[in-house]
Structures are given as structure tokens and as C-alpha cells.
């Protein structure tokens, strides 16, 4: 049995809209159905309808179709907002251009090329003919409109009202001539709905015949309307998935507009001093990468051959050797003048100040009701009502729906680190918003820091100085490699996740990094049997000011005798003073004949007040920090083991309670180390692990 074609692609959808007839003479037909697709099929075939169907409304609440012989452009009709309604109008009746020979044209042009008025199809005056509406059902030979019922060369035509001229073609442009784009069409929002080879585009809100990630509700600013050609991913020009099961996608034939004929509404905001979002609109003159190496000119092929040329990226301002982001990378970058370093990121360019006026929140922001709808990295928030399923997955109560309006930043899950929102980016399902706590707000998010209220247990290169070589297997210890050299430590907290410090990432190019697991020697000597080398697939930066990064591995680590995970503490817990803990690290350790083995230094927990005294009152610790002092003078972390763990034991369970970060001195006698308190960020860590997709092994 031949599969009936899905005709919903032939309709233009207007969400939350219905049509109200002012003229009572206009007919409509209704019927209960399950889907809008069923309505569309019946409308297209006019099956069982006493009129030519030009549009329909699908009532989602009542599961009902309303078929109309009119559309929103007809007289005697008005549009009305309605949450439960979606209006679908047959494109053929609202299109003012033709595709191919114009066989499907059903517009209202009724004048020929030379300006003669058309003769009505039902009339035999002045010209007798056999093109009767009754003989050409479905060809819409209505009134005196230009039509091409037989699909002849030359396009739509009509018999003319001039007795001297029997028939003439009408001057209706090809849609490909009407439609135009600027640059590579990223801001194109036109109505082209077929590819350059004539294939009909698949609707963006459909997953057949091709499954895809570009869901309209996930990407509200990409213009994924109906089945129109778009360029959401920086391709050379707009494209679409096709209805041909054998052709997944194809480009669309849209010409470039003559200068200044189009308003580019969606071009990224241009900045010259700082980066907004991913920096696609950065037009400044920084021309070195993060470490000072100069950039190669974009129009040069030396020392690096490439095809990211000004000709290929006409609107990306690839001038001189300035840092740019023509391809949707994480941030502006360039090819470098060092033959050994192909690409470098210009991460020294500051982010534009994203704080929005006086917007601020109190406590943890659970009552924040402002209208900011952008994440700290500049991504547009996606609508809460499209993400309720995801929200329910990680909270165990019913969120207050009255607060979750539109796509505004909110805190429905009582996150300790402030308002956040879901994004339209599948790689970054959610992120925090750039709102600060209100000045003077001292509401703590965790109380009684120095008293054991909650138990922690659930049932220059940084190095450990003067530590003891470890002989026991510490399988959760990770050596983060940058361009094949050890740069930082880290802790494996889940098969696909490493907890480390944000200072460990001088470049934004993830290809520069690897994680080595199961090793004891920093060079991997003698560890061949137990070593696992894994690529890095994503960095998730911690809440503002945390200095933490969760590093996602490209594939899960295999847990064995040499590689294991370490537990996280309970959120907001405190560990008793004098608890014995350890820090771990590789690198130069103050010994001339350093052997490259993993070292451990033993420390003990110190309360924040006492810690501050040891720092002569120059340091005030807050709820996000934990302090540990050395049992042995001059033993502790130093520049190079950043990202490594402070590990403590409680109730026979070892946990990572702190992360080593720079800026607090290096193994100074009587000067305890200050670490990032993992317990303060435990909920954030669990939320990331729960909500970010990881590769399956």
C-alpha cells in the first residue's frame, strides 16, 4: 500500500492563532481528530468538504479541526489570539511568486504580462474555451486569476478580456528571484521552502523522514518557521532537511540581495572592545592569541594553509590578522604565525559587562522576578514551558508555574548560586544568568560553617612541595595534559567527569587537552598497563567566582584496579576541625633529583576564623572556601597542582572536600592553604552530571 504523503509541509503555521469570521455567510467545517497532520491531509485533498479548503485551525485542547474556505487575507475574516489554537494556511493561496512552472500557483494576480485584465474561467466571453472549473478540480480556476492547470512552459496564464488577444502569460516572478539573503543567510527569514534541486523541505518541527536537533522551541531565535530554508549553523548558505528519505539535507537556491535591500535583524551585536556571547560579532583589533603569539593574516596561506578566507566568509570581517569567530567557535580565534601552533583562541579579550543595570537578587534568587532572559555566556534563554519535563527530572516538588513566565531567568530548584535558565543549545542545556546578589545582602546560603551540622560523608606549574611519594593506588587522581605536558591535577568524580580548576585552561581549543588516568608517574613511565588517555569533549565552568570547572571526557573512563572515582561530600556539610586530610600532585617538589612521582602532603582542617588569624587577618574566608594547614612545616600545595583535590576521610569514606586553586601562597610555614569548598558547590556538580548528556561507553 502506497504511503499517503504528509501534506502539512504545504501550510504556513501561525501558533496560538485562530480565524474569526465576521461575515456570517462564510462556511466552516469541523471534526474531531488527533493531529494537525490529519487536518492538513484532508484540507489538501478537500475530502468531504463542501468548499475549497484554504486554511484550517487545529484546536489542541479539544483535538478538533476547523477547515476554512478562506484565509487570513480574505475579507470578512479577522485573526485572533488563542492559546489552544494553531492556524495553518495553505501556502499556495498566500504566495505571491511561483515555483518552477507555477502549476501550484493559487494567488490572486489577474492581469497579464502586457497589462490586460483576465477573463473569468467560468465565462465564455470574449473567448470560448474548455478550461472549466468543473473539469479541472483542484486547479482552483477561480474568478479570473492567473493559473497553469496543465503545468505548461511559461508559467501561469489566462484568457484575456481583450477579444484580439486570446490568452497571455502573467508576469509572476519565480520565488527564487523574489527571495534574497545577505552574507551567508544566517539572518535570512524568508519563505523559500524547497531546495535548489526542487525537493520540498521538511518542517523543522517534524522528525520525519529525518531526525534532527534543530527544534523550534529549543532555538527560538533561529527562525525555524514551518519548513523554510534557514542557516542555523554557519553553513555557506541556507539549507533544509528534505522530504526525500534518501536526501537528508540540501542547500536552497537563494540569491544574494542587492546592497542594502534587506534589514539584517539577527546579525550578532558588533563589539570592538569586548566579547558578547561567543564573540561572533567581535570587530576589534586584537591580533594575538592568549599567550601573545601574533595571528596570521586571514588572506595569507603561510605558515598555515586554510580555507577560512575572506572570500568564503564575506560578512565576518576577516581583515588583517584580527581575532574573529567566523565559524561559531566558543570565542574569537585566529591561525597563528607560529608554524607549530595552527590555531589559538584570543581568550584575553574580556567579556562585555553582562550585568544589566540595577538587576540583582537576594538570598539565592528564588524570588527573583526580573526580566533578564540571557545566560552569562550570552545565550538566549529558552521558554520554561518547553522545558518542564527536564525540570521535573531534577527537582522533587512541583515548581511554582506562576513564576516561570516566558524565558526569564529564575531559580525554581532552589539553586544556591542564583537564577538560571534553560538554553537553546543542546551542548549547554542550562546556565546561570549574569545577575549579582544585591549589594548589602548578607543572607547566607549555608549556615554555621564551623560547626558539624551536616555530616559530609554519605553513607608557574602547581606542585606538592616536600610531600611523601604515594605508594597506594589513588585511582581518582587525574593528570590534565596541555599540549602533551602535565599542567594540572583533577579528580575523577564520575566515569565521564573530572573536577578541576578553571585556571588550568589557557586555550579554549579542547584538542589541546587530554586526561591521563591510572598513572603514578607524571610521564606515564611504567604505567603503560594501567594508563587510560582520554580526550576532553566539554568544559563546564562553575558558578561565578567558584574557580571550578567540570571537564567532560569524550568517552567514559573504564573503572578498574587503577582507575576509580572519588565521592563528593553532602551539600553544605562541614568537616570537624583537626580532621586529617591530604593533597595530591605531581611536579617539581623542592628536590633537585625530582622523580616525577605523584606526591601526597598531609594537612588538617582548620576553622575559617582561625585560618583568617593565621593569615594575619588579611584574608576573610567565605562560605565557599575551606582551610587546611600543614602538619609538617613547608608542606602543601604550590603553583602547578591546581585543580588537584584536598581529600578527607569521614566514617571510613574518602571524599574530595577541596580543590587547589591559585592565589593563596605556596607552602609557607604557619600559613594554611585555602581551597575551594566542594561541599558548597556539590548541588551544582550533581545538577551538571544529571542534566548534561555524556557519551555512552
Amino acid at each position: 500500500q502506497r504511503k499517503r504523503r504528509n501534506t502539512i509541509h504545504e501550510f504556513k503555521k501561525s501558533a496560538k492563532t485562530t480565524l474569526i469570521k465576521i461575515d456570517p455567510a462564510l462556511k466552516i467545517k469541523t471534526k474531531k481528530v488527533n493531529t494537525a497532520d490529519q487536518c492538513a491531509n484532508r484540507c489538501t485533498r478537500n475530502k468531504g468538504l463542501p468548499f475549497t479548503c484554504k486554511a484550517f485551525v487545529f484546536d489542541k485542547a479539544r483535538k478538533q479541526c476547523l477547515w476554512f474556505p478562506f484565509n487570513s487575507m480574505s475579507s470578512g475574516v479577522k485573526k485572533e489570539f488563542g492559546h489552544e489554537f494553531d492556524l495553518y494556511e495553505n501556502k499556495d493561496y498566500i504566495r505571491n511568486c511561483i515555483i518552477g512552472k507555477g502549476r501550484s500557483y493559487k494567488g490572486t494576480v489577474s492581469i497579464t504580462k502586457s497589462g490586460i485584465k483576465c477573463q473569468p474561467w467560468s465565462s465564455m466571453i470574449p473567448h470560448e474555451h474548455s478550461f472549466l472549473p468543473s473539469s479541472y478540480r483542484g486547479k482552483d480556476l477561480q474568478e479570473n486569476y492567473c493559473r497553469n492547470p496543465r503545468g505548461e512552459e511559461g508559467g501561469p496564464w489566462c484568457f484575456t478580456s481583450n477579444p484580439e488577444v486570446r490568452y497571455e502569460v502573467c508576469d509572476i516572478p519565480q520565488c527564487s528571484e523574489v527571495e534574497c539573503m545577505t552574507c551567508n543567510g544566517e539572518s535570512y527569514r524568508g519563505l523559500m521552502d524547497h531546495t535548489e534541486s526542487g525537493k520540498i523541505c521538511q518542517r523543522w518541527d517534524h522528525q520525519t523522514p529525518h531526525r534532527h536537533k534543530f527544534l523550534p522551541e529549543r532555538y527560538p531565535d533561529k527562525g525555524f518557521d514551518d519548513n523554510y530554508c534557514r542557516n542555523p549553523d554557519g553553513q555557506p548558505r541556507p539549507w533544509c532537511y528534505t522530504l526525500d528519505p534518501h536526501t537528508r539535507w540540501e542547500y536552497c537556491a537563494i540569491k544574494t540581495c542587492a546592497d542594502n535591500t534587506m534589514n539584517d535583524t539577527d546579525v550578532p551585536l558588533e563589539t570592538t572592545e569586548c566579547i558578547q556571547g561567543q564573540g561572533e560579532g567581535y570587530r576589534g583589533t586584537v591580533n594575538t592569541i592568549w599567550n601573545g603569539i601574533p595571528c596570521q593574516r586571514w588572506d595569507s596561506q603561510y605558515p598555515h594553509e586554510h580555507d577560512m578566507t575572506p572570500e568564503n566568509f564575506k560578512c565576518k570581517d576577516l581583515r588583517e590578522n584580527y581575532c574573529r569567530n567566523p565559524d561559531g567557535s566558543e570565542s574569537p580565534w585566529c591561525f597563528t604565525t607560529d608554524p607549530n601552533i595552527r590555531v589559538g583562541y584570543c581568550s584575553q579579550i574580556p567579556n562585555c559587562d553582562m550585568s544589566h543595570g540595577q538587576d540583582c537578587y537576594r538570598g539565592n534568587g528564588k524570588n527573583y522576578m526580573g526580566n533578564l532572559s540571557q545566560t552569562r555566556s550570552g545565550l538566549t534563554c529558552s521558554m520554561w514551558d518547553k522545558n518542564m519535563e527536564d525540570l521535573h527530572r531534577h527537582i522533587f516538588w512541583e515548581p511554582d508555574a506562576s513564576k516561570l513566565n516566558e524565558n526569564y531567568c529564575r531559580n525554581p530548584d532552589d539553586d544556591a548560586h542564583g537564577p538560571w535558565c534553560y538554553t537553546g543549545n543542546p551542548l549547554i542545556p542550562w546556565d546561570y544568568c549574569p545577575i549579582s546578589r544585591c549589594e548589602g545582602d548578607t543572607t547566607p546560603t549555608i549556615v554555621n560553617l564551623d560547626h558539624p551540622v551536616i555530616s559530609c560523608a554519605k553513607t608557574k606549574q602547581l606542585r606538592v612541595v616536600n610531600g611523601i611519594p604515594t605508594r597506594t593506588n589513588i585511582g581518582w587522581m587525574v593528570s590534565l595534559r596541555y599540549r602533551n605536558k602535565h599542567i594540572c591535577g583533577g579528580s575523577l568524580i564520575k566515569e565521564s567527569w573530572v573536577l578541576t580548576a578553571r585556571q588550568c585552561f589557557p586555550s579554549r581549543d579542547l584538542k589541546d587537552y587530554e586526561a591521563w588516568l591510572g598513572i603514578h608517574d607524571v610521564h606515564g613511565r611504567g604505567d603503560e598497563k594501567c594508563k587510560q588517555v582520554l580526550n576532553v569533549s566539554q568544559l563546564v565552568y562553575g558558578p561565578e567566582g567558584s574557580d571550578l570547572v567540570l571537564m567532560k571526557l569524550a568517552r567514559p573512563a573504564v573503572l578498574d584496579d587503577f582507575v576509580s572515582t572519588i565521592d563528593l561530600p553532602n551539600y553544605g556539610c562541614t568537616i570537624p576541625e583537626k580532621t586529617s586530610c591530604s593533597v595530591y600532585g605531581w611536579g617539581y617538589t623542592g628536590l633537585i633529583n625530582y622523580d616525577g612521582l605523584l606526591r601526597v602532603a598531609h594537612l588538617y582542617i582548620m576553622g575559617n576564623e582561625k585560618c583568617s588569624q593565621h593569615h594575619r587577618g588579611k584574608v576573610t574566608l567565605n562560605e565557599s572556601e575551606i582551610c587546611a594547614g600543614a602538619e609538617k612545616i613547608g608542606s602543601g600545595p604550590c603553583e602547578g597542582d591546581y585543580g588537584g583535590p584536598l581529600v578527607c576521610e569521614q566514617h571510613k569514606m574518602r571524599m574530595v572536600l577541596g580543590v587547589i586553586v591559585p592565589g593563596r601562597g605556596c607552602a609557607i610555614p604557619n600559613r594554611p592553604g585555602i581551597f575551594v569548598r566542594v561541599a558548597y558547590y556539590a548541588k551544582w556538580i550533581h545538577k551538571i552530571i544529571l542534566t548534561y548528556k555524556v557519551p555512552q561507553s
Partner: nanobody, 125 residues
Framework: EVQLVESGGGLVQAGGSLRLSCAAS????????MGWFRQAPGKEREFVAR????????SYSDSVKGRFTISRDNAKNTVYLQMNSLKPEDTAVYNC??????????????????RGQGTQVTVSS
């Protein structure tokens, strides 16, 4: 997707010439950077030549520079490799490949999303 079909290979005497063609279907080649690669028996695949989309930028491996010329005819959706002064060491299976512009080196075979099956070129002495 893009389907690439090479033709024009064959047996030729040293010093002779051949013109390889790479015809595409499924997409217009004008949007793609096109490369030619070759692999001799028991050897690594090596880069031969490439031509950019959007501009007449070409590059060649040192071993073929001055003897081979890469060109494209967008109207015919075809890329060519004109091979002159052929040597026995040019014997290999020649592949054409297509990619959209990317940060990766155009000499890196793995950066090309679409690849043909190859055509055999044999140069006898």
C-alpha cells in the same frame, strides 16, 4: 549527501600525462574545498593538491609541484587534476575529497567529510 566519482586513471608511460576528473552529485561543488589524495600500496595516504571554494587558492605537495595542476568547473560540478611529466613513483590510487571550510588543515584527509572511491594511476618506466 555529496557523492564523488573519480575517472581518468589508467596506465601511462613515464613522462606522459593524464587528466583525472572528479564529478559530484547531490550538491553543488562550488561550496566545497576540494582535495586530491593518493595512496600507493603499502604506503600512507598522502596529500596531492587542493583548491579552495570561493577563490582560486591552490596548494600542492612538494613531490608534485610544477607537474600537477588542480582546477574546477563549477558549471559542470567537476574538479580536475592535470598530471604532466608522470613518474613511476606517482603510481597510486587517487582519491578526490570535499569539505566545507574548517579550521583543520586542508592537507588533512580526515577533515574531508566526502570522499570518492578512487581511480588507479599506474606509471610504467
Amino acid at each position: 549527501e555529496v557523492q564523488l566519482v573519480e575517472s581518468g586513471g589508467g596506465l601511462v608511460q613515464a613522462g606522459g600525462s593524464l587528466r583525472l576528473s572528479c564529478a559530484a552529485s547531490g550538491r553543488t561543488l562550488s561550496d566545497y574545498t576540494m582535495g586530491w589524495f593518493r595512496q600507493a600500496p603499502g604506503k600512507e595516504r598522502e596529500f596531492v593538491a587542493r583548491i579552495n571554494t570561493g577563490g582560486p587558492i591552490t596548494s600542492y605537495s612538494d613531490s608534485v609541484k610544477g607537474r600537477f595542476t588542480i582546477s574546477r568547473d563549477n558549471a559542470k560540478n567537476t574538479v580536475y587534476l592535470q598530471m604532466n611529466s608522470l613518474k613511476p613513483e606517482d603510481t597510486a590510487v587517487y582519491n578526490c575529497a570535499a569539505r566545507l571550510p574548517t579550521k583543520m588543515s586542508p592537507r588533512d584527509y580526515s577533515s574531508y567529510a566526502y570522499r570518492g572511491q578512487g581511480t588507479q594511476v599506474t606509471v610504467s618506466s
